[in-house]
């Protein structure tokens, strides 16, 4: 019996506009029917929370109102978009995947993902 | 810093109740996972209950399942463990601990509270 | 449930020896293991976290290595605040199951 196995890709670079997708995809050792996603930040050695969203299986992910990541479910795969990110933002993501119901608990964690973030360079005054 | 203490414990009957609390301080309460572990006298740790985040998800041991009930309440930072039916085997120290975040590892314990259960 | 087995369940060694303690889950549970160390009257004290991860103030006398199954503890030379009791436990599923417990005592 092997553990839950948590997919997301390595590497993903965040538009222009400071938004970034990645999908999250999980294998299930169980029949879940509510499941919580976590987005964190692993820089150094310190993990911070960045958003989190309990869904049902079937129906669609919602995340909290002030929250800068959205996303959509389908099956064992969560599609996230994180926005708002600066070149500061820069840093390891984790997919942090929590089967909650019914019991047993299962967790599992992705590798990460490193989103880079480049600050556009701001438009240069044009002399008319 | 963080800081987790417990409350509660002491002599109590067989088939009697008992209510444990754990006061948080120090981090955002909320956003993680709190657990019950117990250590009867002499014995090694055993894990005995769990309550996830808002507070809407619980897990609990066999050998306390539908006995005890852990609740929390994120305005107050605390944690509870209601303890119903009493046994002599439920004499331990119980100890409240943060899961961590990203891989639940305990890493910040309190003190611990007794519980004798005897007649 | 997943149950977590622990060898040997006491030892005896001396200051400077190096010590094993292997810890053995019933099914796979990644990395999602932690090492604790507990003193008689004192609440248990983190050492290793992910199967091999040490935790922050903690010695790097202490390492822990494995995934899957097979989980190992090592003290690559005991000192004298090492005597205590060191014990395994399961963060992948629940029950959060600990191991039994290996009692490091003074030779």
């Known amino acids: 019996c092997k553990a839950m196995h948590v997919a997301q890709p390595a590497v993903v670079l965040a538009s222009s506009r400071g938004i970034a997708s990645f999908v999250c995809e999980y294998a299930s050792p169980g029949k879940a029917t509510e499941v919580r996603v976590t987005v964190l930040r692993q820089a150094d050695s310190q993990v911070t929370e960045v958003c989190a969203a309990t869904y049902m299986m079937g129906n669609e992910l919602t995340f909290l109102d002030d929250s800068i990541c959205t996303g959509t479910s389908s099956g064992n795969q969560v599609n996230l978009t994180i926005q708002g990110l600066r070149a500061m933002d820069t840093g390891l993501y984790i997919c942090k995947v929590e089967l909650m119901y019914p019991p047993p608990y299962y967790l599992g964690i992705g590798n990460g993902t490193q989103i880079y973030v480049i600050d556009p360079e701001p438009c240069p005054d044009s002399d008319f | 810093q963080v800081q987790l203490v417990e409350s509660g414990g002491g002599v109590v009957q067989p088939g009697r109740s008992l209510r444990l609390s754990c006061a948080a301080s120090g981090f955002t309460f909320s956003s993680y996972g709190m657990h019950w572990v117990r250590q009867a006298p002499g014995k090694g740790l055993e894990w005995v209950a769990v309550i996830w985040y808002d507070g809407n998800n619980k897990h609990y041991a066999d050998s306390v399942k539908g006995r005890f009930t852990i609740s929390r309440d994120n305005s107050k930072n605390t944690l509870y463990l209601q303890m119903n039916s009493l046994r002599a085997e439920d004499t331990a120290v119980y100890y409240c601990a943060r899961g961590d975040m990203l891989t639940g590892y305990y890493g910040y314990w309190g003190q611990g509270t007794l519980v004798a259960v005897s007649s | 449930d997943i149950q977590m087995t622990q060898s040997p369940s006491s030892l005896s060694a001396s200051v400077g020896d190096r010590v094993t303690i292997t810890c053995r889950a019933s099914q796979s549970i990644s990395s999602y293991l932690n090492w604790y160390q507990q003193k008689p009257g004192k609440a248990p004290k983190l050492l290793i976290y992910?199967?091999?991860s040490l935790q922050s103030g903690v010695p790097s006398r202490f390492s822990g290595s494995g995934s899957g199954t097979d989980f190992t503890l090592t003290i690559s030379s005991l000192q004298p605040e090492d005597f205590a009791t060191y014990y395994c436990?399961?963060?992948?599923?629940?029950?959060?199951?600990f191991g039994p417990g290996t009692k490091v005592d003074i030779k």
């Open positions: 436990q399961q963060s992948y599923s629940t029950p959060f199951t």
């Open positions: 992910a199967a091999s």
